[in-house]
Interface confidence: low
């Protein structure tokens, strides 16, 4: 009679996440008696999966009945995979002996590939926020994917960035993969409602990647442009002046009124108006009682946003005139090295 | 036995490229992947990038990208590293290594290649 | 990128001592840490790959051990040839990354 032979007809398998795995093992005859044993891997550090003489093996199933005496199936089904299992499995012939069983034949191995999703991408910017025209880091991850093979892809509202390097680790062979990746984006004024998206696509997705966001909101800071205006007289020795804070992102706004370098008054923005790009405008205004100036007042409007360092702009007005020949002045000086006007 | 044969020492203006071959032997030169590492003078060890030689991966040092380009040849089952806009820092030994594919350790070296940049 | 930290930077011992080499990395990198020793004028010599494993050839003196972010090398009873320089290399993340290196003088 022909020697026993072992047959594993599946070379691999390829099995999802939380799925049953069918690895099929056949003898071609009923001699020599003896049981057979599952294993992951060969040699000395061998796994042992199934054992059909004893042992208590939880999540391993066997396919047909070990109990009947002509039966030659050993194939075994193993339950709620995970990318740990992933590995070259053993069907193993042992002939009875005493006091132990003796290896007699193995099959030659079925390889048992995991497909893991990718975790949702996660995306986190920079922790402080930047101006526009400045370059910011987002980072992108997504974590326990299985075969390696991914595509990750930035954009911003909608259009794909070039400028990121993406790392898979570990590098080597691995159960799962984490992958890691910094693009480079560039801010403008109006990236208050822009989104940055990290896209991840891999084969257990079936063609739905997917997203990680994040809004540059957080991100980005505009600073304020400042216009300081003299308003028509309300009364004889009465000018209002009113300061226009433009365009400005985020909210926290706090602006000081300065008569002569002298602090006049110091009030938080509440009632803002809001700009289609998402900034902010705001306006506070100053009546000045020209009859209580002897000379010339220099008025300036400060603006401290966002914990920045103040910016302002100053406006002269003569006292020396008549209130109502400056009425409709509405010539603004500069400051110095202390201004900023972004237009 | 395992060998790593590399070219011999150069001397190159700043501004200038080099090419630093690798010959390997004694073992399946497309079942490995091919190092790169440099050691500047008195300095510890940098790596630069590696090419899988089986299919021509090929990775780089961020430091080095646009500077270095390693290809290789099967049929020779040489590597190759060259490194172009030369300057004096980067007069170093350069090492090929042979890395396994699992753990990525490096467990052949070459003798190394001493690259002087001086003008 | 990962950041691989040695520590001492050198090391001064006697023939016959036991010496314990410190690397630290920056994240977990699970067991993808390898050991070299390098003598001078001569190519890095790999010692330990995976952290713990001793590759062939290489004296039973040597060991490492350690996972995630802590590893060591340790040499029992230092023979006169085990002075050298040693780095550690992760391999778990590109770009791949050596330690400073450790000088063992005698002392």
């Known amino acids: 009679e022909e020697e026993l032979q072992v047959i594993q007809p599946d070379k691999s398998v390829l099995v999802a996440a939380g799925e049953t795995a069918t690895l099929r093992c056949t003898a071609t005859s009923l001699i020599p008696v003896g049981p057979i044993q599952w294993f992951r891997g060969a040699g000395p550090g061998r796994e042992l999966i199934y054992n059909q003489k004893e042992g208590h093996f939880p999540r391993v199933t066997t396919v047909s009945d070990l109990t009947k005496r002509n039966n030659m199936d050993f194939s075994i089904r193993i339950g709620n995979i995970t990318p740990a299992d992933a590995g070259t499995y053993y069907c193993v012939k042992f002939r009875k002996g005493s006091p132990d069983d003796v290896e007699f034949k193995s099959g030659a191995g079925t390889e048992l590939s995991v497909r893991a999703k990718p975790s949702a991408p996660v995306v986190s910017g920079p922790a402080a926020r930047a101006t526009p025209q400045h370059t910011v880091s987002f980072t992108c991850e997504s974590h326990g994917f299985s075969p390696r093979d991914i595509t990750l892809k930035w954009f911003k509202n909608g259009n794909e960035l070039s400028d990121f390097q993406t790392n898979v680790d570990p590098v080597g062979e691995s159960v799962s993969y984490s992958i890691h990746s910094t693009a480079k984006v560039v801010l403008t004024r109006e990236d208050v409602h822009s989104q940055v998206i990290c896209e991840v696509a891999h084969v257990t997705l079936q063609g739905d990647p997917l997203r990680g966001t994040a809004n540059l909101s957080e991100t980005i800071r505009v600073p304020p442009t400042l216009e300081v205006t003299q308003q028509p007289v309300r009364a004889e020795n009465q000018v209002n002046v009113t300061c226009q804070v433009r365009k400005f992102y985020p909210q926290r706004l706090q602006l000081t009124w300065l008569e002569n370098g002298n602090v006049s008054r110091t009030e938080t923005a509440s009632t803002v108006t809001e700009n289609k790009d998402g900034t902010y405008n705001w306006m506070s205004w100053l009546l000045v009682n020209v009859s209580a100036h002897r000379d010339d007042v220099k008025l300036t409007c400060q603006v401290e946003h966002d914990g920045q360092p103040a910016v302002s702009k100053s406006h002269d007005l003569k006292v020396s005139a008549h209130p109502k020949e400056q009425g409709s002045n509405t010539a603004a000086e500069n400051t110095g090295s202390n201004e900023r006007n972004i237009y | 036995q395992v060998q790593l044969v590399q070219s011999g020492a150069e001397v190159k203006k700043p501004g200038a490229s080099v090419k630093v071959s690798c010959k390997a032997s004694g073992y399946t030169f497309t079942s490995n992947a091919m190092h790169w590492v440099r050691q500047v003078p008195g300095q510890g060890l940098e790596w630069m990038g590696w090419?899988?030689?089986?299919?021509?991966?090929?990775k780089y040092s961020q430091k080095f990208q646009g500077r270095v380009t390693i290809t290789r040849d099967t049929s020779a089952t040489t590597a190759y590293m060259e490194l172009s806009s030369l300057r004096s820092e980067d007069t170093a030994v350069y090492y090929c290594?042979?890395?396994?594919?699992?753990?990525?350790?490096?467990?052949?070296w070459g003798k190394g290649t001493t690259v002087t940049v001086s003008s | 990128d990962i950041q691989v930290t040695q520590s001492p930077s050198s090391l001064s011992a006697s023939v016959g001592d036991r010496v314990t080499i410190t690397c630290r990395a920056s994240?977990?990198?699970?067991?993808?840490l390898n050991w070299y020793q390098q003598k001078p004028g001569k190519a890095p010599k790999l010692l330990i790959h995976?952290?713990?494993s001793l590759q062939a050839g290489v004296p039973s003196r040597f060991s490492g051990s350690g996972s995630g972010t802590d590893f060591s090398l340790t040499i029992n009873s230092l023979q006169p040839e085990d002075f050298a320089t040693y780095y550690c290399q992760q391999s778990y993340s590109t770009p791949l990354s050596f330690g400073g290196g450790t000088k063992v003088e005698i002392k």
């Open positions: 995976a952290a713990s």
């Open positions: 290594a042979r890395g396994d594919y699992y753990y990525y350790y490096m467990d052949v």
């Open positions: 994240q977990s990198i699970s067991d993808f």
């Open positions: 090419i899988k030689a089986g299919n021509a991966e090929i």
